[in-house]
């Protein structure tokens, strides 16, 4: 509900300064406040605009100050406006100057349908004149010279809402800067009766509080609060839920109060008279000092709060017994909170006696909207009331106010929130390389819209044409590998960025789409690499049996061990062999292979030759004859690599006798470099040469190493070994 | 928490009297006008009495005029309703409630009365 | 008297749909000086009190959930479930409190289909 409150410093204007200050308590109005003059009320009066500014001391609130010297230019009708979702409220007050001829009893007067009522003015002046009374700036009434009493009344027997208006007071040679104006509401309803037809029956509205005639809620007059104006507020504070607070030195004293109508205006609490300059006399409290106190049991009566009940004692005159009751206090509220646009709960928290209830909890949006708990809970101190807003987006950012209205009081907190967009990624991430199991991604997620700074990110990604849920991972890099992916399967993926606070998760951005790779064949078996002459090699496998209808074809890679010279072959997957040629002669290569489809297959081990050789192999090295004995010794010896050398020739013959009486052996694996001659002659020296040969020819042996057996008795003499061929 | 706890339902004949009560907590019970309304079974609600928060102005149904009298004990927070003359068509549910503006914001748990021979 | 009449009667709606309960008064219960409805819309569940869900034709109870709204003026007005759940099976009265006596629809039973 909207809380407009008026206040009239100083409504009889002398020379010193006076103000209107209009003050929107609690809500935020949707256009500004409005303060004007009332020509409805007084169509003669000054005609100037008035020079309205922002109340530095209050958030919502417009101000009119009139410096002393234009005190004559005062004198009317003054209504202040506010509007909030469509609704507007006008609050109407009067300002005079105290020199008149006559002055009002109060500056406006609340009366039921059908009251009897009378209108009262006093004579501060004496003239020899005729009085006159204007309703609404038209004559209604006069009386003779000699006949104005100290009081000048106005009768109205039968009041009906007609009868409502600003009637005013003056001598005949007067004018309206001499003229006193009170202002009568009439009630469209009788006594403690409200609605459309003023048929159903009011609430009471305790201390001096006024009963809506078409809300049946209860006006609280300044200093009172609650559903039935039954609580009073602390010491110098006013509105709806007392949150207001008068700055002056004494409190509110010098301000009157126009609330809207049918209340209109008074003192706060405590004060009385025209100007609310003086103070309640002992025993009355309330508004105007209206309201007497009656304490039960000899209480202490403030002027302010009336019975001040002692403990285990309410009730206006402290005749209830019970628990005190405690104004609500709002706790646990921030007064700022930032929020994640989508689903929030924003929890009112509030203590008292008696505790709130979940109707009695509620939650004003900026525009306005009132919202009720969604969920309510109490402890034995505080209630708990939890709202829902289903989906909270950046214009609902600013003022929000958390209202308690209780029996025992009312209280408001605003606080500010602040919504923020959820981030969420431009652009799609990128794939920078996959493979039949692996994806590296590059999450791209910056730039992004919406709020941050950013959290956590998450990668998604899911097979696309699977009903399965979205995986994601946590990343941290811009760079990030995906594991243990199917092959050959399309996946989808995006990236969803995390603000701070609940509900922080922004929406997946842009969706990429990419492929694995088909899982690797294994490579060919039985590989076998041979040279087949000095400038090729033939390479081997067995039949290749693919178990998918793909293509398929065997890549073969063969480099040079001495030379940075690499090539890769594309062989048909029917074949079983490859030649490999335009190489160097006496040169060592390595060769592997694989299978491929569409995707590359396992690569072979590497296989290892050497093209045949263009020259005569070189002699063996490191000859030597160990192990001698009666009968045998062994020979060893070392060759060089890279000459294609197929065999190893040992040529002996006994010393003296001719060369066609040698004896060759020779040994077709180039791999064994050690051999045991046997069969030989007890003590006899023999001539032995080794040679090696390959597809040229045979070494040239520069000089023969000889041999002699030792007698039979004579153990042998280990001289080392190698491999050895026996 | 506001309640209203009623008692005083039952059976009696036809043309004999019942008083029901309607005691109140929780609530400033003397600043608030107080209704009773009744559900006769299987139907509808239907409007019976309501009396001002001070007891001075009381209204009622024109199906229960002249029969039936609303009051209430503000020093004990009760709200009574006395009814004489029952007939038939008084069997209901009779239900004590607070108002919120004309709304009927709190009710009592409900009291049985049957009126029958 | 100014009279209330509900349609339908009875109403069945699956779980999870929209249900709409219509309210037609006899006369009008917008009161133009501060353009507000006067009427009030109640579920009531069996052996149990009726229960305030909304008031001025459209300002939802404290407490009461927000799949319920208010809409209307003058002589029509609608309250609507906008997603039914099964805790919302009850008897549903509108009330007009524009005059005395306060008058009640004969009320809508809504079930699940």
């Known amino acids: 509900a909207m809380d407009l409150i008026l206040i009239n410093s100083l409504p009889l204007v002398s020379d010193a300064e006076t103000s209107l200050t209009c003050i929107a308590s609690g809500w935020r109005p949707h256009e500004p406040i409005t303060i004007g003059r009332d020509f409805e009320a007084l169509m003669n009066q000054h005609q100037d605009p008035l020079e309205v500014t922002q109340d530095v001391t209050r958030e919502w609130a417009k101000k009119v100050v009139w410096k002393r010297e234009k005190a004559s230019k005062i004198n009317g009708a003054y209504f202040c406006e506010g509007r909030v979702r469509g609704e507007a409220i006008r609050i109407r007050t009067m300002k005079m100057r105290q020199q008149a001829s006559f002055l009002p009893a109060t500056l406006t007067m609340t009366v039921d349908k059908g009251d009897n009522v009378n209108i009262s003015f006093k004579k501060v002046l004496i003239k020899e004149e005729d009085a006159v009374i204007y309703k609404n700036g038209s004559f209604i009434h006069s009386v003779p010279r000699h006949e104005v009493p100290d009081i000048l009344e106005v009768h109205l027997p039968h009041a009906q809402p007609q009868d409502a208006g600003v009637y005013s007071a003056r001598y005949i040679g007067g004018n309206l800067f001499t003229s006193a104006f009170t202002r009568l509401i009439v009630r469209r309803c009788e006594a403690q009766k409200w609605g459309p037809e003023c048929n159903h029956l009011c609430t009471a509205c305790m201390n001096n509080g006024v009963c809506h005639e078409d809300t049946g809620e209860c006006i609280c007059p300044p200093g009172f609060m609650g559903r039935t104006c039954e609580k009073a507020c602390e010491l110098h504070t006013f509105g709806r839920t007392c949150k207001e607070r008068c700055s002056g030195q004494e409190g509110c004293k010098s301000y009157v109060f126009c609330l809207p109508d049918p209340y209109g205006c008074s003192c706060a609490t405590g004060w009385k008279g025209l100007q609310c300059n003086e103070a309640c006399h002992p025993g009355f409290y309330g508004p105007d000092c209206k309201l007497r106190c009656s304490c039960n049991n000899g209480e202490m009566c403030d002027r302010f709060q009336g019975c001040l009940c002692s403990p285990g004692w309410q009730g206006l005159q402290c005749e209830r017994e019970g628990i005190p009751r405690m104004t609500p206090k709002i706790v646990d509220l921030p007064d700022h909170i930032e929020v994640n646009s989508g689903k929030f709960n924003p929890i009112c928290k509030a203590s008292g006696w008696p505790l709130p209830t979940n109707e009695e909890m509620t939650l004003v949006k900026p525009d306005g909207t009132v919202l009720h708990p969604k969920d309510f809970n109490h402890t034995d101190h505080f209630s708990v009331a939890i709202f829902t807003i289903h989906r909270i987006l950046p214009p609902d950012s600013g003022v929000w106010v958390c209202s308690v209205n209780t029996v025992a009081g009312m209280v408001e907190k605003p606080f500010n929130i602040s919504v923020k967009v959820l981030p969420k990624p431009l652009n799609a991430p990128n794939v920078i390389d996959t493979g039949h199991n692996f994806a590296v991604i590059n999450i791209s997620s910056e730039p992004y819209f919406g709020d941050g700074p950013i959290k956590s990110k998450k990668l998604l990604y899911k097979p696309v044409n699977h009903y399965e849920a979205w995986q994601h991972i946590q990343v941290t890099n811009e760079i990030v590998t995906l594991n243990y992916l199917e092959p050959r399967t399309e996946y989808e993926l995006c990236v969803q960025l995390v603000r701070r606070g609940e509900g922080g998760e922004g929406h997946p951005g842009p969706v990429r789409r990419f492929t694995t790779a088909s899982i690797g064949l294994p490579p060919p078996r039985g590989l076998n690499l041979l040279p087949k002459s000095q400038t090729t090699l033939n390479l081997t496998w067995q039949p290749i049996f693919p178990s998918s209808e793909d293509d398929f074809y065997v890549e073969v890679e063969r480099r040079s061990v001495q030379k940075s010279d690499q090539q890769n072959i594309k062989v048909p997957g029917n074949l079983t062999s490859v030649l490999l040629n335009n190489l160097h002669p006496r040169e060592q290569y390595v060769v592997r292979a694989r299978v491929n489809t569409k995707a590359q297959g396992e690569w072979s081990e590497d296989l290892t030759a050497w093209t045949l050789s263009d020259i005569l192999p070189p002699q063996p090295e490191n000859i030597k004859i160990s192990n001698i004995t009666h009968s045998s010794a062994v020979i060893s010896w070392t060759i060089l690599d890279g000459y294609s050398i197929s065999s190893i020739t040992i040529r002996y013959k006994v010393q003296g006798k001719n060369e066609d009486q040698h004896v060759d052996v020779k040994i077709k694996n180039a791999t064994i470099t050690q051999y045991q001659l046997k069969g030989l002659e007890p003590e006899t020296a023999y001539q032995v040469d080794i040679f090696a040969e390959n597809n040229i020819g045979s070494s040239n042996p520069a000089f023969s190493h000889e041999l002699v057996t030792l007698p039979e008795s004579q153990a042998p003499a280990d001289l080392g070994g190698g491999k050895m061929l026996l | 928490q506001v309640q209203l706890v009623q008692s005083g339902g039952g059976v009696v004949q036809p043309g004999r009297s019942l008083r029901l009560s309607c005691a109140a907590s929780?609530?400033?019970?003397?600043?608030?006008?107080m209704h009773w309304v009744r559900q006769a079974p299987g139907k509808g609600l239907e409007w019976v009495a309501v009396?001002?928060?001070?007891?001075?102005?009381?209204y009622y149904a024109d199906s229960v005029k002249g029969r039936f009298t609303i009051s209430r004990d503000n020093s004990k927070n009760m709200l009574q309703l006395q009814m004489n003359r029952l007939r038939s068509e008084d069997t209901a549910v009779y239900y004590c409630?607070?108002?919120?503006?004309?709304?009927?914001?709190?009710w009592g748990q409900g009291t049985v009365i049957t009126v029958s021979s | 008297d100014i009279q209330m009449t509900q349609s339908p009667d009875s109403l069945a709606v699956s779980l999870g749909e929209r249900a709409t309960i219509n309210c037609k008064s006899s006369?009008?219960?917008?009161?133009?000086?501060?353009?507000?409805?006067?009427l009030a819309w109640y579920q009531q569940k069996p052996g149990q009190p009726p229960n305030l869900l909304m008031y001025?034709?459209?300002t939802r109870e404290s407490g009461v959930p927000d799949r319920f709204s208010g809409s209307g003026s003058g002589t029509d007005f609608t309250l609507t479930i906008s997603s039914l759940q099964a805790e919302d099976v009850a008897v549903y009265y509108c009330?007009?409190?524009?005059?005395?006596?306060?008058?009640f629809g004969q009320g809508t039973r809504l079930e699940i289909k």
């Open positions: 409630a607070t108002p919120k503006g004309g709304a009927l914001e709190i």
């Open positions: 929780g609530l400033t019970f003397s600043n608030y006008a």
């Open positions: 009396i001002s928060y001070d007891g001075e102005n009381k």
């Open positions: 006369q009008s219960a917008l009161y133009s000086s501060n353009n507000k409805n006067y």
């Open positions: 001025w034709a459209s």
């Open positions: 009330q007009q409190y524009y005059s005395a006596p306060i008058t």
